[in-house]
């Protein structure tokens, strides 16, 4: 028998600084977690201990902290390269700077490989970007080899800014000849990275024979066996055991996300390759292991830079914003109620008469909404806040839309309702009910707009033929987390102003802020 | 574009060792296998073993084991190959290559380095 | 070891004429296989690897085929910078082995 220990991370979204415990900007420092000096502790720590380990990364590095607006990836291939990462997945964020902003800064510059067996490239692009990502990579891990077929969530191109000449293929589709391909090379001991959620990992190891082990990301998913050491309430035992197709026991595993955990998976090969046992539990990185002081000065260094952005307090709260996913893709949340406040502010116009405002409504997706603020911090609000909240540097754009499309979105906002994905809306000048008893496509039960042609605004019932103005992210402008309705039916499409530089700009304004979760979005049973 | 720049010939008496060099350039040296293969006078090729420079992991024919000693040195972006107690049937020349994806045949090729053992 | 076993070992062709080289493995190796091509004095090129995908740049008159044992290299239309000597190998498994070579010739 073999043993292998797959340490792991996923959707750490540049969380290179040890942060709190809702993966918020740390404030304690004794009761912080994660970051990179941190989770370079424990990797060499088990590095040491244990004969043959691969640390592997499944995706979703970009995007997240004020370290990503400014390094734009260079800070993740860095500190990955520092920490010695045997291989990584690309994830859908880590197109957000188009395929440049990813080949420059991170294909360029890994010393590790960087996976996708399902993004094929065409045109012009594919001689450029040869070589730079691989379908699979053989290992050397010790006297053995292991395999590892890298994948890639094909709902990026309505995620991200892949561009045209990235076809994102079938995961399974496209993974299975590339182990086969592993298997032709005598390669028996085979690991699937990739970043397209916990269903479709489970379905990877399911569906694609020889797969032996499924290391996840994308839907931040929390798995583990006994008592959870922190916050994350577990989807399930980790690994979670997935009976394949031709009835082999395979574990599936992701680690949470922000780099707040190192998964942690032992896993024991006979000599054909075959999974004998399987067992670990993600590590939680908290203040009990130190920061690894060669790795945090090198932080301190590159942080030098960061520092004009994240000194400037823009204003204060007296609320916890909650920001996080668990609220803001499940129900009315104040960090988007703020949010939606600020775009409509931003949008004031004054010109006629008849309307006390040419806009009332604003529309954001839950999933935009990437991090609580802690009100704790004497209440600061800064634009580093702002840009974890707030990391994609969007814009709030103007659209004009008939009161069809909108049904439509907020019907497509609870269609797959609880899976924790990002097309929840949070709303300003809107009062929705959704009635979750009744079928995908039906759940909207009341949906009631606040007027704009009126002295005194008030909320009236939404008209199915009528053209409404609405403040929304250029992102599902753009058909972004599968609001195709939008892009295809909007009537007019203005781009407005970035997105932290609208939230700032209000709170600045505003100067002490303290939204409520006050009724805007609301569910009931029964008949309306 | 990638290359891979060999040094230069050398000749050597029998149960002397030889130590080739392999410079890269034009990618990532540390995500791609280098793989040493040589060609005897006049004869066809033979695989000698290869290095994973990500973690100087080596694999050797086991008709080379002992005798060839496979090295890297990333900072300098360069693989070594060294072979001891040389006899006359190891005069030939040495190349150094690299893939595409892993294993599936050798891409980029040294010029090669001719290793005359002679006494 | 596995023992990849070129036939013909010399071939005289002409400008334009259809070549067809073969590789015999000694033991099943899938589609483990590569071909190169090489010239006096010059390091070796790779044609194709897979089998049958065909190496950034190679002309499309080369194409390979075959699977377990018996292996092609197929050129459609011998042109004139195509005379030199032909090696497959095989990667399936270690270690890994090369044909003896076909060197393809001026009729």
């Known amino acids: 028998a073999w043993e292998l220990t797959i340490l792991h991370t996923n959707d750490v979204h540049s969380r290179l600084e040890q942060t709190s415990e809702d993966s918020s900007k740390c404030v304690n420092a004794s009761r912080c977690m994660g970051g990179v000096a941190r989770l370079f502790t424990k990797v060499q720590q088990i590095r040491r201990a244990e004969p043959n380990v691969l640390l592997l990364d499944a995706g979703d590095q970009y995007q997240g902290t004020i370290w990503f607006t400014v390094y734009k990836g260079a800070e993740v291939a860095h500190f990955m390269n520092a920490l010695r990462y045997d291989a990584m997945a690309l994830g859908n964020h880590e197109f957000d700077n188009g395929v440049e902003g990813l080949i420059e800064p991170l294909l360029k510059e890994a010393k590790f490989p960087i996976l996708s067996a399902n993004i094929k490239a065409k045109g012009p692009l594919a001689s450029q970007i040869s070589g730079l990502y691989l379908p699979y990579k053989v290992l050397p891990v010790g006297d053995e080899v292991v395999g590892i077929v890298g994948y890639t969530s094909k709902e990026t191109p309505f995620l991200s800014n892949p561009g045209t000449n990235l076809v994102f293929e079938d995961e399974i589709t496209a993974l299975q000849p590339e182990v086969d391909k592993l298997k032709t090379l005598n390669v028996n001991k085979i690991i699937a990275l990739g970043h397209s959620g916990f269903e479709m990992d489970k379905l990877i190891a399911q569906k694609v024979r020889g797969v032996d082990v499924v290391v996840g990301g994308h839907s931040n998913t929390f798995l583990y066996t006994g008592n959870p050491p922190s916050k994350e309430v577990p989807a399930g035992k980790y690994p979670f055991i997935v009976t394949s197709d031709d009835g082999r026991k395979v574990p599936v595993v992701q680690a949470y996300a922000f780099g707040k955990y190192l998964g942690y998976l032992k896993i024991e090969f006979d000599e054909r390759g075959n999974v004998i046992s399987s067992h670990g539990n993600p590590i939680l990185l908290n203040s009990s292991i130190p920061e690894d002081p060669s790795i945090k000065a090198d932080i301190n260094k590159w942080r030098i830079k960061l520092d004009n952005y994240s000194t400037q307090e823009l204003g204060k709260t007296i609320v916890y914003l909650d920001g996080s996913s668990q609220s803001c893709r499940f129900r009315e949340c104040n960090m988007g109620n703020l949010i939606c406040d600020a775009m409509i502010n931003n949008n004031l116009r004054h010109t006629d008469e008849m309307f006390w405002n040419h806009v009332s409504m604003c529309i954001l997706n839950g999933g935009g909404i990437r991090s609580p603020i802690d009100e704790r911090n004497n209440g600061t609000i800064t634009w580093e806040n702002l840009a974890a909240v707030l990391p994609f540097g969007g814009t709030f754009d103007l659209v004009q839309l008939k009161g069809s499309t909108l049904k439509k979105a907020f019907e497509h906002s609870v269609h797959r309702y609880g899976q924790s994905t990002g097309e929840f809306l949070q709303v300003g000048g809107i009062h929705v009910v959704y009635d979750l008893s009744r079928k995908p496509g039906d759940r909207v039960v009341k949906l009631d707009v606040l007027c704009t042609k009126c002295r005194v605004p008030s909320y009236d019932p939404l008209k199915m033929d009528e053209v409404y103005k609405v403040i929304l992210p250029n992102f599902l402008a753009n058909g972004g987390d599968g609001f195709q309705m939008i892009k295809d039916e909007l009537l007019r499409h203005d781009s407005g102003d970035q997105d932290i530089n609208v939230v700032s700009t209000y709170i600045s304004k505003m100067k002490v802020i303290y939204p409520a979760v006050e009724g805007r979005i609301k569910f009931s049973t029964g008949s309306h | 574009q990638v290359q891979l720049v060999q040094s230069g010939a050398e000749v050597k008496k029998p149960g002397a060792s030889v130590k080739v060099s392999c410079k890269t350039s034009g990618y990532t040296f540390t995500r791609y296998y280098i793989y040493w293969v040589r060609q005897a006078p006049g004869q066809g090729l033979e695989w000698i073993g290869w290095i994973y420079p990500g973690n100087f992991n080596t694999k050797y024919n086991e008709k080379f084991k002992g005798r060839a000693t496979l090295t890297a040195d990333t900072s300098a972006s360069t693989a070594y190959m060294e072979l001891s107690s040389l006899r006359s049937e190891d005069t030939a020349v040495y190349y150094c290559?690299?893939?595409?994806?892993?294993?599936?045949?050798?891409?980029?090729w040294g010029q090669g380095t001719l290793v005359t053992v002679s006494s | 070891d596995i023992q990849m076993t070129q036939s013909p070992s010399f071939l005289s062709a002409s400008v334009g004429d259809r070549v067809t080289i073969t590789c015999k493995a000694s033991q099943g190796v899938a589609t483990a296989v590569a071909w190169y091509q090489q010239k006096p004095g010059k390091s070796p090129k790779l044609l194709i690897y897979w089998a049958s995908t065909r190496h950034t740049g190679v002309p499309s008159r080369f194409s390979g085929s075959g699977s377990g044992t018996e292996f092609t290299l197929t050129i459609s239309s011998l042109q004139p910078e195509d005379f030199a000597t032909y090696f497959c190998?095989?990667?399936?498994?270690?270690?890994?082995?090369f044909g003896q070579g076909t060197k393809v010739e001026i009729k």
């Open positions: 190998q095989q990667y399936s498994s270690y270690p890994w082995t």
């Open positions: 290559a690299r893939d595409v994806y892993d294993y599936a045949g050798f891409a980029y």
